[in-house]
């Protein structure tokens, strides 16, 4: 008789990332009887929440329910009902809830409570909400990647899963850039390490892994756009502030009380003689990055070799997948591909910083102003981080792959968080079975 | 690792009511589902309660519904469980349990891991 497939037993799960600009809800799935196995996880589905990130409600929390409801129906949909009470469902929050609970650990509290009466109103199995530290952020992020990249399996394939994946199991680096903070985690080289802090040993799939990882709070792009606005006024002889990061012709006004908003900008905070600034762009690469640099401190380092503000960092080792911010700024100027350069990207920023803001309005007319008009800035930002700040250079450039999805999946910490609270990264290598019991009769 | 202390056990008469509480330390108490356990002599540790890391989500046995109530309040670390109609068969050892980014459904089904106090007395007298 023939082989008939029998129906899949199927898990689901939902983890909701509250970053700092959104939140949004990633739907995973997996053959329940290959739960131990690597790489059988995979996203089906990301919606993205209408609206800010959920640190912005904190002076509307009634409204959290309201904003959550399409996402959270959206995954009613898209999940069989034999299903619902089985899922579980996890909300992780970053920097923008960090830099929240750094004002008023209350006030955090008050949004995660509410977070959680939203949430529990649906079917689903609500697990928690909760502030993720920095360096689960990092970590989750490097275990996601190198998941999806066939990085823990012991089997060897004799083909390539995806275009940057080397058949080694010489594990990718991680380089996350969100909207208030940015991660790095690679294994370095030298076992050893100079700062614990920034030490974590994982046994994954039978294999010791000894990372490095640290979170950079306020070094997000729209963080550290902040910073260099707080940076830069203090000098502004008036209330017009003529700025390199912004396209020639670009104009916009900005609340000082907005500006002074975030704990981000407290080490640039003075008394202004006005309430309001003016942005005028200037459109100069060179230049801004120059304002740039200097929200990185490296005249000070206890150890051998510092990223920034005295930051331990090891010599980097490996590939890096580079992606969240990294990918979606990179991708929307062309320049995530393999082929181009670390001077060639130099080199079209400069062109496209220079471009006058009508043009660039004309060109890319789908494109929010307000999302659009940065990226000259995040752009730049993001070279003088991978260069200055993580002392990528021009040869190690090559290491660097922009990713967005591996096979499907969206890089970023999420699938990383599930598989560890869901115990689906075994420590020790699973016996393998010939064949699943039950896929065939 | 969270540390978990109980108290308030103690002898009571059928029909009355006893207040139990746990006060955590380490970790961040929100983060955990809190939930209470009972043991009577020669019996398997049964669920009896539990209760979200920000109290919207309570699950209670069958056996307690109507007559107990958990509650928590995240300022003091501290969860409660308010038992009142006690009857001699409530007579058990009580555990108070915490476990991480677990829902309260998990816990009762005894899954995931869970972080268990050291116990308290309930004795109910006839």
């Known amino acids: 008789t023939q082989n008939k497939a029998l129906p899949e037993n199927i898990k689901y799960g939902i983890v909701l990332d509250a970053g700092s600009s959104h939140t949004s809800l990633y739907i995973y799935k997996w053959p329940a009887e290959k739960e131990n196995d690597t790489g059988v996880v995979h996203q089906v589905e990301e919606c993205r929440v209408k609206g800010p990130g959920i640190s912005k409600y904190v002076q509307k929390v009634n409204e959290i329910g309201i904003y959550l409801t399409d996402c959270m129906e959206r995954a009613r949909e898209v999940i069989p009902r034999s299903q619902h009470q089985e899922t579980p469902v996890y909300l992780g929050a970053t920097a923008g809830m960090r830099l929240l609970r750094m004002e008023s650990e209350e006030l955090a509290d008050r949004v995660l409570d509410v977070v959680e009466r939203s949430l529990s109103n649906y079917p689903f199995d609500f697990q928690g909400a909760r502030i993720i530290t920095g360096q689960e952020e990092g970590a989750y992020g490097w275990i996601t990647i190198n998941y999806l990249l066939g990085k823990f399996s012991q089997k060897t394939r004799w083909f390539s899963i995806v275009p940057y994946e080397t058949n080694n199991q010489e594990t990718f680096g991680a380089l996350d850039l969100g909207g208030a903070s940015t991660q790095i985690t690679f294994v370095p080289q030298n076992q050893t390490t100079e700062s614990p802090d920034n030490a974590l040993q994982f046994r994954l799939y039978g294999k010791d892994y000894n990372v490095y990882t640290h979170s950079f709070l306020c070094y997000g792009k729209d963080q550290a756009l902040w910073q260099k606005l707080a940076k830069d006024i203090q000098v502004a002889s008036n209330e017009i502030l003529r700025d390199p990061c912004f396209h020639p012709g670009y104009k916009k006004v900005v609340n000082v009380s907005d500006l002074y908003k975030t704990p981000c900008t407290k080490r640039f905070e003075m008394t202004l003689p006005f309430q309001q600034f003016e942005i005028q762009g200037i459109g100069n690469y060179q230049q801004c990055h120059q304002s740039v640099l200097e929200l990185f401190n490296t005249s000070y380092c206890p150890y051998s070799q510092c990223a920034f503000n005295g930051i331990f960092l090891p010599p980097l080792q490996g590939d890096f997948g580079a992606f969240s911010a990294f990918y979606f700024v990179m991708n929307f100027l062309n320049l995530t591909s393999e082929k181009v350069s670390q001077e060639k990207v130099t080199e079209m920023m400069k062109k496209f910083c220079s471009q006058p803001w009508e043009e660039i309005k004309t060109s890319y007319a789908g494109v929010k102003e307000k999302y659009l008009s940065e990226y000259c800035f995040s752009g730049t930002y993001i070279l003088s981080l991978l260069l200055q700040g993580y002392h990528f250079t021009a040869d190690s450039w090559e290491h660097i792959h922009f990713i967005g999805k591996i096979q499907g999946s969206d890089a970023g910490w999420t699938l990383g968080y599930m598989l560890n609270l869901t115990n689906m990264i075994p420590a020790e290598q699973p016996l393998s079975t010939p064949l699943s019991h039950s896929t065939y009769v | 690792q969270v540390q978990l202390q109980e108290s308030g056990g103690g002898l009571v008469q059928a029909g009355g009511s006893l207040r139990l509480a746990c006060t955590v330390s380490?970790?961040?108490?929100?983060?955990?589902?809190m939930g209470w356990f009972r043991q009577a002599p020669g019996q398997e540790r049964d669920f009896v309660t539990a209760?979200?890391?920000?109290?919207?989500?309570?699950h209670y046995a069958d056996s307690v519904k109507g007559r107990f109530t958990i509650s928590r309040d995240n300022a003091a670390n501290t969860v409660y469980l308010q038992m009142n109609t006690l009857k001699p068969e409530d007579t058990a050892v009580y555990y108070c349990?915490?476990?991480?980014?677990?829902?309260?459904?998990?816990?009762?089904?005894?899954?995931?891991?869970?972080?268990w106090g050291q116990g308290t007395q309930v004795t109910v007298s006839s």
């Open positions: 380490r970790g961040t108490f929100s983060e955990y589902s």
């Open positions: 349990a915490a476990a991480w980014q677990t829902s309260p459904r998990r816990m009762m089904q005894m899954a995931g891991s869970i972080t």
């Open positions: 209760i979200s890391g920000f109290g919207h989500i309570t």
